[in-house]
């Protein structure tokens, strides 16, 4: 049974937010054995996902179809949340990641039970798929902390390619590190609210 936990951190923007609290509240999904075989998440965190410009990411998901909206939310509408599962990555990213002892921090993102965001590198798209553990590499994203309490999500399977916003949809965007590292369309905010 799922409980709505009240977390001490309002933004998952830095490692301190994740590790600082002594009482790291494990999401019960992990307790129920939904963690990757042989790899346990460091922690799991429920957060709403919004863009740098404060548009909300919402999910309309059926058994056979889905839509991912990037939109200004109506005042009376609760924000959707994603379950972020944090893992220590063994694979170096194309830039120095945010981790401990040289290890990257990777995340998976789930909007509801048994479904995860996945990178489709051929189509440059972000998709939702029903998966069983262990999750495919396409479901893992290296987490990068940016300025202004923002994060970005880099594809594990395609370094240099990030989840971003294009034409009011989520898409995969290749980033030129020398020019567009702070590009707003790959910046996201994570919030408990």
């Amino acid at each position: 049974m799922h409980h709505h936990h009240h977390h001490h951190h309002h933004h998952a923007a830095g490692l301190n937010d994740i590790f600082e609290a002594q009482k790291i509240e494990w999401h019960e999904a992990a307790i129920e054995g939904r963690s990757i075989t042989g790899i346990s998440p460091i922690t799991e965190y429920l957060a709403s996902l919004s863009t740098y410009n404060d548009q909300s990411i919402t999910f309309a998901l059926e058994d056979e179809s889905y839509e991912i909206y990037v939109e200004d939310l109506k005042k009376d509408k609760k924000k959707d949340k994603v379950l972020l599962s944090y893992y220590e990555s063994q694979h170096p990213s194309s830039e120095s990641g945010d981790g401990v002892d040289g290890k990257m921090l990777m995340v998976t993102l789930s909007p509801t039970k048994d479904f995860w965001l996945q990178a489709n590198n051929k189509e440059h798209s972000v998709e939702l798929h029903k998966c069983e553990k262990p999750l495919p590499d396409q479901a893992f994203f290296v987490l990068h902390n940016r300025s202004f309490n923002c994060v970005s999500f880099e594809c594990k399977t395609d370094p240099g390619v990030f989840i971003g916003v294009k034409d009011n949809h989520l898409a995969l965007i290749k980033v030129d590190y020398s020019e567009n590292l702070g590009s707003e369309n790959i910046l996201f905010k994570l919030s408990e609210i």
Epitope: H4, E62, D63, K77, K78, D80, K81, S110, P111
Partner: antibody, heavy 126, light 106 residues
Framework: EVQLLESGGGLVQPGGSLRLSCAAS????????MSWVRQAPGKGLEWVSG????????YYADSVKGRFTISRDNSKNTLYLQMNSLRAEDTAVYYC???????????????????WGQGTMVTVSS | SYVLTQPPSVSVSPGQTASITCSGE??????AAWYQQKPGQSPVLVIY???KRPSGIPERFSGSNSGNTATLTISGTQAMDEADYYC?????????FGGGTKVTVL
């Protein structure tokens, strides 16, 4: 194909009880919030009760609170409505309805009713 | 409790446009859905999220929502569109329906 099949309706005396069932098929039942909506003869639609998929939280209209109990058995793909202390004004066709989309981790009743059963008639009369 | 108000009836000639209103306090802050119900049948969702049509619903059905009023518009109304129409919103984890509008195609 999504199918919702209600059963359990019938004639009952005021103060009596009935248990409605809704057998679901064609979708992942455990992932969707479900509701009961009723319609008195010649009247409009009235939402009665709903139940979350994520944590099985329950919600009720004021008119039935304390008398009706909604529940679900995900292993049987079945939604229930236990109706006690029935009154004449509870006479209606009772529809089982599925949310259009799977429930997000936020939980609660948030989405429109995408699919409806054919309804089962409940008559409360002496 | 939250109240949604619809006109009891709307009459329209075949091929003309029928507009059904649904009024509620700060309606535009909520997402409106519309259901069609023909006699002896279960309701069918025809509009959700104010403006979106489920698959299988004809393009002549459209919706809008702003201020205190949501509107369902049926363009080029056909005889088969004669039915009762209900608006609905979610308010504090409860469903709230309007009283319904009977659309008669003359």
């Amino acid at each position: 194909e999504v199918q919702l099949l209600e059963s359990g309706g019938g004639l009952v005396q005021p103060g009596g009880s009935l248990r409605l069932s809704c057998a679901a098929s064609g979708f992942t039942f455990s992932s969707y919030a479900m509701s009961w909506v009723r319609q008195a003869p010649g009247k409009g639609l009235e939402w009665v009760s709903g139940i979350s998929a994520i944590d099985q939280s329950t919600y009720y209209a004021d008119s039935v609170k304390g008398r009706f109990t909604i529940s679900r058995d995900n292993s049987k793909n079945t939604l229930y409505l236990q109706m006690n202390s029935l009154r004449a004004e509870d006479t209606a066709v009772y529809y089982c309805a599925r949310d259009l989309w799977m429930e997000n981790w936020v939980g609660g009743l948030r989405y429109p009713f995408g699919y409806w059963g054919q309804g089962t008639m409940v008559t409360v009369s002496s | 409790s939250y109240v949604l108000t619809q006109p009891p009836s709307v009459s329209v000639s075949p091929g003309q446009t029928a507009s059904i209103t649904c009024s509620g306090e700060r309606m535009g802050d909520k997402y409106a859905a519309w259901y069609q119900q023909k006699p002896g049948q279960s309701p069918v969702l025809v509009i959700y999220r104010d403006t979106k049509r489920p698959s299988g619903i004809p393009e002549r059905f459209s919706g809008s929502n702003s201020g205190n009023t949501a509107t369902l518009t049926i363009s080029g109304t056909q005889a088969m569109d004669e039915a009762d129409y209900y608006c609905e919103v979610k308010k504090s984890d409860t469903g709230v329906f309007g009283g319904g509008t009977k659309v008669t195609v003359l």
